[in-house]
């Protein structure tokens, strides 16, 4: 039961995490205008991975896509790539893990195959989560660097009475969504890997016991499941005799636009 719960929970946590990674990737608020220096601005700027937006105090919001590929900073391209890789790996992981779930019976799929698939999906979730966390962290680092650069340049080069306040950007909501989502996907992946260990049938090495019946010399070897060595299904290991000693899990498995800062 504990293994099924761990696997199920790992799947759900990963599902939420990947949904969060997708949401973060699509969100426009990766960086938002820092209002500390100009809290009275009537125009609010924010930027995403795919477009930049301006919300006027009237409520009117205008967004412009980054219609150039070569003109964008390499770091932004890298973040996009990391997030997309994270989504793709996560999606494949989800697909694999659905078939690996113990509560879902597909044909005569053996536990060893399910364990194999659970481990595969778990690794995919871990890599997916790491990609998202890395992508968000790279973007955050880029923001911090640009923030201090623009702070240093804020009032330089302007003589006289005129002030030119350079727009500075700080962390947007998408960064926090991305970090949390990446973390959840990572945790879900770890849980899947832990569940995989419980799913893999263990080698049961029973000692051969010789029973000497009067007049006969018969050696009876209890076999139970002749366990395969791990994750590949071994077709030679036929079920000879069900020894009755099963885990709770086995009993419970029923069928069921531009400038970029």
């Amino acid at each position: 039961m504990a293994v099924t719960a761990c696997q199920g929970l790992g799947f759900v946590v990963s599902l939420i995490g990947i949904a969060g990674i997708i949401a973060a990737t699509c969100m426009d608020q990766w960086s938002t205008q820092d209002l500390y220096n100009n809290p009275v601005t009537a125009v609010f700027n924010y930027q995403g991975l795919w477009r930049s937006c301006v919300r006027e105090s009237s409520g009117f919001t205008e967004c412009r896509g980054y219609f150039t590929l070569l003109g964008l900073p390499a770091m932004l391209q890298a973040v996009r790539a990391l997030m997309i890789v994270g989504i793709v790996l996560g999606a494949i992981g989800l697909l694999v893990s659905i078939f690996a779930l113990k509560c879902i019976r597909i044909g005569s799929m053996e536990d060893s195959a399910k364990a194999n698939m659970t481990l595969t999906s778990g690794i995919m979730f871990i890599v997916s989560g790491l990609c998202a966390i890395a992508g968000v962290s790279v973007f955050a680092n880029m923001l911090v660097t640009n923030f201090w650069m623009s702070t240093a340049n804020m009032y330089t080069g302007m003589g006289g009475m005129v002030q030119t306040v350079q727009t500075r950007y700080t962390f947007g909501a998408a960064l926090f969504v991305g970090w949390v989502a990446g973390g959840l996907t990572l945790i879900g992946g770890v849980m899947m890997c832990i569940a995989c260990r419980g799913l893999a049938p263990e080698e049961t090495n029973y000692k051969a016991v010789s029973y000497h019946a009067s007049g006969h010399s018969v050696a009876y070897k209890p076999g139970g499941f002749k366990a395969s060595t791990g994750f590949g299904s071994n077709t030679k290991n036929k079920k000879i005799y069900d020894g009755g000693a099963r885990t709770e899990d086995e009993v419970q498995s029923y069928p069921s636009k531009h400038d970029y800062v």
Partner: antibody, heavy 119, light 113 residues
């Protein structure tokens, strides 16, 4: 068509209060910010503040924060501005103006209400 | 608060003339996010409410004749009337639309010569 009809002229004594109204028609009242602007005799325009009828959220010019109170009545599509502790320098024409959607600028203005403060 | 300074304060011209008036702001009204200048021009005739002419420094409001044009960026802006018509004699105000409180210039009064 869009119309903003303001209440009639008011004559008040110093220290009194006055509540000006601006009735909107011809558009969805709750979708646009309503601005209030003051113009003293022979002077320029001064922005008092604005209110969003849907949320009741306001933004005041610091200069008028203790002078003006902006409110709305969604049921009658009417915006109000109450001016308190009136003084002779509050004698002016007060305009309400609808927020322009697509730009920050108001695009429809009321005809104005003249407030005279005299002892 | 952003200070808006208009010049000249009054201007005499004849019908058919090309007229230019300027507006200076104490801070840049250029928004880096969309490269738009948040400056608006209004026309006001005696006893009437102001009328929106131009927003975003150069975008003409619908229904405004093409003889009115706005230009400039950052802190320096210009309103040009290419060929004055009798109905254009009025007071023109520029307004900061970038930062609260929204501030107006002192106005330029356009009179008949």
């Amino acid at each position: 068509q869009v119309q903003l009809v303001q209440s009639g002229a008011e004559v008040k004594k110093p220290g009194a209060s006055v509540k000006l109204s601006c009735k909107a028609s011809g558009y969805t009242f709750t979708s646009y910010w309503m601005h209030w602007v003051r113009q003293r005799p022979g002077q320029g325009l001064e922005w008092i503040g604005m209110i969003h009828p849907n949320s009741g959220s306001t933004n005041y010019n610091e200069k008028f924060k203790s002078k003006a109170t902006l409110t709305v009545d969604k049921s009658t599509s009417t915006a109000y501005m109450e001016l308190s502790s009136l003084r002779s320098e509050d004698t002016a024409v007060y305009y309400c103006a609808r927020r322009y959607y697509g730009s920050i600028s108001p695009d429809y203005w009321g005809q104005g209400t003249t407030v005279t403060v005299s002892s | 608060d952003i200070q808006m300074t208009q010049s000249p304060s009054s201007l005499s011209a004849s019908v058919g003339d090309r007229v230019t008036m300027t507006c200076k702001s104490s801070q840049s009204l250029l928004n880096s996010g969309n490269q738009k200048n948040y400056l608006t021009w209004y026309q006001q005739k005696p006893g009437k409410a102001p009328k929106l002419l131009i927003y975003w420094a150069s975008t003409r409001e619908s229904g405004v004749p093409s003889r009115f044009s706005g230009s400039g960026s950052g802190t320096d802006f210009t309103l040009t009337i290419s060929s004055l018509q009798p109905e254009d004699f009025a007071t023109y105000y520029c307004q900061n639309d970038y930062s609260y409180p929204f501030t107006f210039g002192g106005g330029t009064k356009l009179e008949i010569k």
